[in-house]
Amino acid sequence: ALDTNYCFRNLEENCCVRPLYIDFRQDLGWKWVHEPKGYYANFCSGPCPYLRSADTTHSTVLGLYNTLNPEASASPCCVPQDLEPLTILYYVGRTPKVEQLSNMVVKSCKCS
Amino acid sequence: ALDTNYCFRNLEENCCVRPLYIDFRQDLGWKWVHEPKGYYANFCSGPCPYLRSADTTHSTVLGLYNTLNPEASASPCCVPQDLEPLTILYYVGRTPKVEQLSNMVVKSCKCS
């Protein structure tokens, strides 16, 4: 699986999940999130060669097409597969609110 | 929606579905498919600016991150959203077989 367990431990050129730390205030300009100050959102990147974690028949066909026609511009792309939520603390006036934001952290990638 | 109705009628630089005709024999080296000789598989491409057909909260966050930090390499990718099947005819010996291959034709795209 192209997940954090594998990808963070190996120098992998092809499609894999990569670490990306986002500081809410500095990187997004968000002051409203009180805690945490930032988090590992991560992201997916890297080429998608033939049959690498192919998501659909189309991505397999496109991977084969790209392999046999390397001059072509059409190829599958490395995108998130499994995502996890992030719990944040923010304030409405002086009232603290805890919210779980869904699909905030990339745990694995696929070729789509 | 970033679908064929919109994308094929407009010169759109950002994420959109693009026409791609694949000839089974010439492009994939597949002799086994008797009919059709080829089909419009289509593909997705183009940049994913902030909020363009964002798939998840993560892709929205990443789009904002990329907008505010344009030197960053992390950005959402334009990938298939809706796919349709393709019906093919092939032979096993002299016996004709009809098969519906799922997820073969891209009809619309999203930023993931």
Partner: nanobody, 114 residues
Framework: QLQLVESGGGLVQPGESLRLSCAAS????????MAWFRQAPGKQRELVAL???????NYADSVKGRFTISRDNAENTVYLQMTELKFEDTAVYYC????????WGQGTQVTVSS
């Protein structure tokens, strides 16, 4: 039930040759795109060579000119002739068939060592 059975792996010295075989059963072999992948320790599987049913072939840059993929539809077998083997060719080699979906063999170990 589909089966892909690899054979022909072993221990060789640099510069020597090996021929891998993959016998297929339970699929329409003549229609399948056949491929050899390899996986070195701590690495993902990578495509080594593929051959379509129309005999289109493709090779990884690292093996071009040294490896040759071929198929025998009468015998339902795909071969990988490997020459001028190098240390970096050491890996488990997997046979793959794609026909409507992907199928994998169990793998055969190739070790290049002096």
């Amino acid at each position: 039930q589909l089966q892909l059975v690899e054979s022909g792996g072993g221990l060789v010295q640099p510069g020597e040759s090996l021929r891998l075989s993959c016998a297929a059963s339970g699929i329409i072999f003549s229609a399948s795109t056949m491929a050899w992948f390899r996986q070195a320790p701590g690495k993902q599987r990578e495509l080594v060579a593929l051959i379509t049913d129309g005999d289109r072939t493709n090779y990884a840059d690292s093996v071009k000119g040294r490896f040759t993929i071929s198929r025998d539809n009468a015998e339902n077998t795909v071969y990988l002739q490997m020459t001028e083997l190098k240390f970096e060719d050491t890996a488990v080699y997997y046979c793959n068939a794609f026909w409507l979906k992907a199928y994998w063999g169990q793998g055969t170990q190739v070790t290049v060592s002096s």
